[in-house]
């Protein structure tokens, strides 16, 4: 029976700069029941605080709700593991909410085959930003990426869409059924998960781009 091993805070993520969650990996348990606590202070403060919510983010997590989340402030946090034989502390982690944003996937992806009379046909897609993100405040610039592939293909074809929420693709294989997905990323931060796949059947008479 030993003191617990050193825990590690391995990830902090925010969906929208308004709340965030951090997760830690326990070290070895030393063969005894181990209690974990996360303490933090904001840089420039002297008072330490303890995690306000160990529940929302699941096991081994700390969730910071709106009233505990400050942009432009660096959080300094560590996890303490304690059992009957002693304690161990994680390394301090410095967290700036601005740089840990991982949005939810974009919403309402719609895909259509457009066949204008006077121009080549194309695949047109549009989507909406995730609901948790308020783009009107100017705090966010969201960038988008699209990927698509024929249903039975192994490889995805990826296109960067920049800040626009619609996109055209000209080069497609006639008669194929395609899967299309979109994801987004703030200017500083992490890519979201891909949106659920939307399927589109390309007509057999679709004319490939020269």
């Amino acid at each position: 029976q030993l003191p617990p091993g050193k825990p590690e805070i391995f990830k902090c993520r925010s969906p929208n700069k308004e709340t965030f969650t951090c997760w830690w990996r326990p070290g070895t348990d030393g063969g005894l029941p181990t209690n974990y606590s996360l303490t933090y202070h904001r840089e420039g403060e002297t008072l330490m605080h303890e995690c306000p919510d160990y529940i929302t983010g699941g096991p081994n997590s700390c969730h910071f709700g709106k009233q505990y989340t400050s942009m432009w402030r660096t959080y300094v946090m560590m996890v303490n593991a304690t059992n009957q034989m002693g304690s161990s502390f994680s390394d301090e982690l410095y967290v700036d909410v601005t740089y840990i944003v991982q949005p939810d996937p974009p919403l309402e992806l719609t895909v259509e085959v457009k066949q204008p009379e006077d121009r080549k046909p194309y695949l047109w897609m549009k989507w909406s930003p995730p609901t948790l993100i308020d783009l009107k405040t100017g705090w966010f610039t969201l960038l988008y990426e699209i990927r698509l592939k024929p249903e039975k293909a192994a490889e995805w074809e990826t296109h960067f869409a920049g800040q626009q929420t619609e996109f055209k693709i000209l080069s497609l294989h006639p008669g194929q059924k395609y899967l299309v997905q979109v994801r987004c990323k703030p200017d500083h931060g992490y890519w979201s998960a891909w949106s659920p796949a939307t399927f589109i059947q390309i007509p057999s008479d679709f004319i490939m781009n020269d």
Epitope: S37, E45, L47, H49, E50, D53, Y54, N80
Partner: antibody, heavy 118, light 107 residues
Framework: EVQLVESGGGLVKPGGSLRLSCAAS????????MNWVRQAPGKGLEWVSS????????HYADSVKGRFTISRDNAKNSLYLQMNSLRDEDTAVYYC???????????WGQGTLVIVSS | DIQLTQSPSFLSASVGDRVTITCWAS??????LAWYQQKPGKAPKLLIY???TLQSGVPSRFSGSGSGTEFTLTISSLQPEDFATYFC?????????FGGGTKVEIK
């Protein structure tokens, strides 16, 4: 509606002990640091002790250090103050208060009176 | 320990008056200061936190300002229900401390 209700106050002789309780309702008790604050008759407010969400951070005023012990039971939504070696100067109304770490002591109980007298 | 000095200790004023209470900290506390109102036989009530943020449900005639070592609580137009004792509190470092209080009485 947030409610904090203190109990356990009363008359005790110098050197005696009391245990105060604070029952919380209408809040996610486990998400907040909690505090005891006291007010001697006709005097100002004095912070006594604070305890963090999972009890990993505990602090006391110098005037009670070594004599008072703060604790909490999140499963019972309850805060406690064990007071030993009581002195005349501990006579006061004792309030429990929720500490919103983003703000201040935003909810207070109605208080319980502790009288230390021979 | 950080000492908080409130001025004045007593203040006589009339309904409609503009009232200012000052709280000085013995060392810098950034903006970690709160103001409370207490009426006889009642628990304190939070008015202002982080020096200038109005607590939800508190009338807008109350305002706070300052940072570092000097802070003020202002009541722009005193109402009958505002006659009470006001306390400042620092939340910058332990031990958390309160000012001595300012009693606002009817002139």
């Amino acid at each position: 509606e947030v409610q904090l209700v203190e109990s356990g106050g009363g008359l005790v002789k110098p050197g005696g002990s009391l245990r105060l309780s604070c029952a919380a309702s209408g809040i996610t008790f486990s998400s907040y640091s909690m505090n005891w604050v006291r007010q001697a008759p006709g005097k100002g407010l004095e912070w006594v002790s604070s305890i963090s969400t999972r009890s990993s951070l505990i602090h006391y005023a110098d005037s009670v250090k070594g004599r008072f012990t703060i604790s909490r039971d999140n499963a019972k939504n309850s805060l406690y103050l064990q007071m030993n070696s009581l002195r005349d100067e501990d006579t006061a109304v004792y309030y429990c208060a929720r500490w919103d770490a983003a703000a201040a002591f935003d909810y207070w109980g109605q208080g319980t009176l502790v009288i230390v007298s021979s | 320990d950080i000492q908080l000095t409130q001025s004045p200790s007593f203040l006589s004023a009339s309904v409609g008056d503009r009232v200012t209470i000052t709280c000085w900290a013995s060392q810098g506390i950034s903006s970690y200061l709160a103001w409370y109102q207490q009426k006889p036989g009642k628990a304190p009530k939070l008015l202002i936190y982080v020096a200038s943020t109005l607590q939800s449900g508190v009338p807008s005639r109350f305002s706070g300002s300052g940072s570092g070592t000097e802070f003020t609580l202002t009541i722009s137009s005193l109402q009958p229900e505002d006659f009470a004792t006001y306390f400042c509190q620092q939340l910058n470092s332990y031990p958390l401390t309160f000012g001595g209080g300012t009693k606002v009485e009817i002139k």
